[in-house]
């Protein structure tokens, strides 16, 4: 008797998902000497164990704890870069500024970046046809819970001055419903984090507005201040120039106006 597969609204598991995760793990440990103790087969087994044979709308953070334990990694103080709705630029930045780290520069974030996955209740199969959509199906799906879990941990372990890159082109520069707004902001530890510095990235070349005065940034400042963490904000008016100056800080044109600083 054929068993009818659950149809979800989201796209299915990324093609060759197991191979991708394992190969990324091998590559990551090859490049990062401090992670060469990691056994990638065990990492994959823990990843698989978090969602295989489980109903994909009932995944919990607990399901990912064995994986989180295996992927334990620390970022030096002052070197954490969070981002919201501006992933590409954040990643371009850390590729140049190699001593700063986004979540996707860490093992677990690197393994899962841009991938989708889910299983099916009571079978050992991976569902390549469809996976739950966060809005249309459920929020407790394997992908969403994974990012919530690792984002929480990433924020919890941050220390010193934490930086966040925000997209100044969006109507809500700071969005309370984003992973940054709903998870990371609330899991920064005041006893370890002295300050949060927001970098608001401008979209238009002629945009000279002070986006640090945006109501949503004021909202972020309020949330952070209430948590006894200081808040700073910078406008990055020219992201292309900003990256260029990170690459070549000695360039004479880099000594002026790529950003405007606000102390709050």
């Amino acid at each position: 008797v054929p068993r009818w597969r659950q149809q979800w609204s989201g796209s299915g598991t990324t093609s060759r998902f197991p191979e991708t995760v394992l190969a990324r793990c091998v590559k990551y440990t090859e490049v990062h000497p401090e992670m060469r103790h990691v056994d990638c087969q065990s990492v994959w087994d823990a990843f698989k164990g978090a969602f295989i044979s489980k109903y994909p709308c009932n995944i919990t953070e607990e399901d990912y704890q064995p994986l989180v334990k295996l992927g334990t990694q620390t970022v030096p103080c002052n070197k954490t870069l969070l981002w919201s709705r501006i992933k590409d630029l954040a990643h371009q930045f850390t590729q140049v500024q190699r001593d700063m780290f986004t979540l996707e520069d860490m093992l677990l974030g690197y393994l899962a970046d841009d991938l989708t996955w889910c299983g099916e209740f009571n079978t050992f199969e991976i569902n390549y046809q469809s996976c739950p959509d966060w809005r249309k199906d459920c929020s407790n799906n394997p992908v969403s819970v994974f990012w919530k879990t690792v984002s929480r941990r990433f924020a919890e372990t941050a220390c010193g001055v934490v930086h966040v890159m925000l997209n100044g082109s969006r109507s809500k520069i700071f969005d309370k419903n984003s992973t940054f707004g709903s998870v990371e902001v609330h899991n920064l530890q005041p006893e370890k984090v002295q300050a949060l510095e927001a970098w608001v990235i401008h979209g238009g070349r002629e945009d000279s507005r002070d986006l640090c005065q945006d109501p949503t940034i004021k909202e972020l400042e309020s949330i952070i201040s209430k948590r006894n963490i200081r808040f700073f904000c910078k406008n990055i008016y020219r992201p292309d120039k900003f990256l260029q100056c990170v690459k070549n800080p000695e360039d004479s044109s880099c000594l002026s106006g790529i950003h405007h600083h606000h102390h709050h």
């Epitope: 394992l22 190969a23 793990c25 590559k27 090859e30 103790h37």
Partner: antibody, heavy 116, light 107 residues
Framework: QVQLVQSGAEVKKPGSSVKVSCKAS????????ISWVRQAPGQGLEWMGG????????QYAQKFQGRVTITADESTSTAYMELSSLRSEDTAVYYC?????????WGQGTLVTVSA | EIVMTQSPATLSVSPGERATLSCRAS??????LAWYQQKPGQAPRLLIY???TRATGIPARFSGSGSGTEFTLTISSLQSEDFAVYYC?????????FGQGTKVEIK
């Protein structure tokens, strides 16, 4: 149980090239790295480079850069190491091994003799 | 590149005795060090990785220690099958490099 089986011994002229194959069986080939290590007669071990077949981007030791080409064919679970511009000092046993930095499974070795 | 120096070049030991092999790195390799055993006409075999973790199937008489630049492989009670050449290898910095080997022979 993963096994790596290498191609047979080769005798080559100086200046020519040699291509050694390494076929994997009994395990998942694509995402583990395959490295190449050589050993000249009576000498120690020397890492030449490696590849993660899934990504297909090889990594080479500086010493062999420009002379060695490491490739992998996922469809046949086979890795290849080609060494060009051979000289007498390249006479050695060439091993493939599983792993990108520590090598837990080794092929049986392929003797390459470079002689005029 | 990092130079790995093993000592002694040859170690003569009686069966049942303890053997201690040393490996020194020209700069710190943290704990990213492996030990291999090689018998004549055979491929090397991984014994220890991460400086002190025994590979699958390796008997407990083999143990590794050290970190940074100084490492030791100890064989607590030599068996006849342990007489071979032993190599250390660092995998902290590209290119990975091996020591020149220590030959453990029957006294």
């Amino acid at each position: 149980q993963v096994q790596l089986v290498q191609s047979g011994a080769e005798v080559k002229k100086p200046g020519s090239s040699v291509k050694v194959s390494c076929k994997a069986s009994g395990g998942l080939f694509s995402f583990y790295a395959i490295s190449w290590v050589r050993q000249a007669p009576g000498q120690g071990l020397e890492w030449m480079g490696g590849i993660i077949p899934f990504f297909g981007e090889p990594q080479y030791a500086q010493k062999f850069q420009g002379r060695v080409t490491i490739t992998a064919d996922e469809s046949t679970s086979t890795a290849y190491m080609e060494l060009s511009s051979l000289r007498s000092e390249d006479t050695a046993v060439y091993y493939c091994a599983r792993g990108s930095y520590r090598f837990d499974v080794w092929g049986q070795g392929t003797l390459v003799t470079v002689s005029a | 590149e990092i130079v790995m120096t093993q000592s002694p070049a040859t170690l003569s030991v009686s069966p049942g005795e303890r053997a201690t092999l040393s490996c020194r790195a020209s700069q710190s390799v943290s704990s990213n060090l492996a030990w291999y055993q090689q018998k004549p006409g055979q491929a090397p075999r991984l014994l220890i990785y991460g400086a002190s973790t025994r590979a699958t199937g390796i008997p407990a008489r083999f143990s590794g220690s050290g970190s940074g630049t100084e490492f030791t492989l100890t064989i607590s009670s030599l068996q006849s099958e342990d007489f071979a050449v032993y190599y250390c290898q660092q995998y902290n910095n590209w290119p990975w490099t091996f020591g020149q080997g220590t030959k453990v022979e029957i006294k």
